[in-house]
């Protein structure tokens, strides 16, 4: 019998408010046995896949997606899904990336550390098999 797949979670390092030109890494997390993680923009037609998946703990796998130099076009909501053959999971909650001008003024908001969106219930949508170009400026990475 096929197992029920837990929903993934998504977080951003160093946070979700990123100065223009700085880097951000989205971290997708899921269960043991994930083969592919996908980071999606608000429209599912723009996404990036990685098969570079590591087991972070005995119960949790992860993949990392890095944007080296954030631009205004990178702002917006992101979410993760994963493929554990033969099924795709549901999506994580959205995580909103905010890009701020590097004015350096005293009222500039600090980068929010460790922002994340964990699993909460939302309707299932399993139509994840369309193929589309990877998001500009996104690349998959794995860091140790």
């Amino acid at each position: 019998q096929e197992e029920d797949l837990p929903r993934p979670s998504i977080s951003a390092e160093p946070g979700t408010v990123i100065p223009l030109g700085s880097h951000v890494t989205f971290v997708c997390r899921g269960p043991v046995g994930v083969q592919t993680f996908r980071l999606e923009r608000e429209s599912r037609s723009t996404y990036n896949d990685t098969e570079d998946v590591s087991q972070a703990s005995p119960s949790e796998s992860e993949a990392r997606f890095r944007i080296d130099s954030v631009s205004e076009g990178n702002a917006g909501p992101y979410r993760c899904i994963y493929y554990k053959p033969p099924k795709w999971s549901e999506q994580s909650d959205y995580l909103e990336l905010l890009v701020k001008e590097t004015s350096g003024g005293p009222d500039s908001p600090d980068t929010e550390p460790g922002s994340s969106a964990g699993p909460t219930q939302r309707p299932s949508d399993n139509s994840h098999n369309e193929h589309a170009p990877a998001s500009q400026g996104l690349k998959a990475e794995h860091l140790y």
Epitope: Q35, S57, P58, H142, Y144
Partner: antibody
Amino acid sequence: EQSVEESGGRLVTPGTPLTLTCTASGFTISDYHMCWVRQAPGKGLEWIGLIRASHSTAYASWANGRFTISRTSTTVDLKITSPTSEDTATYFCARYGGSGIGCNLWGPGTLVTISS
Amino acid sequence: ELVLTQTPASVSEPVGGTVTIKCQASQSIDSNLAWYQQKPGQPPKQLIYAVSNLASGVPSRFKGSGSGTEFTLTISDLECADAASYYCECTYYGNSYVGGFGGGTEVEIK
């Protein structure tokens, strides 16, 4: 019942390229990453390489250039490009179970003997 | 290049005893570790995945532990059927490095 099976092992002379084939039953092989592992007589397991579902490959450093892994929609192949006597071994194909799980569904192996 | 060093190379223990096998990685591999049992003429059989998870059908006498670079397989209440070779595997085959197998430990039951 899910299973994998290797074929193509035989006696060949040194320098003669040899291709081994892995087939699957009970699951769709193209959905999975697949590993090749070998074991020389009386020795331990040696990981050769892996082909991902996307067709990208990863090899052990010692295996780079000596082996080529490829796949079709129904099979995964291991080519020994220029065999030497040190390549005499049982060659195993295994399905990669995903992160943390590794190569967990193994075939029975196929014996390759390199001798003049 | 990642190296997995398994110790001891061989061990002999009586029925009912306990065997501890260590696997040391040359760099941190987080929880990307599995353990296998292999008997002569057979392919390896997975015992443990992701450091400490028991594979389907494997008795709870087999226990995996560790993290980072140091990992352990403990077999308690040894039975004659446990006589075999045991291997650790780093299960990460990504962009940072590729895994592989330890050198193996032969377990003899007295």
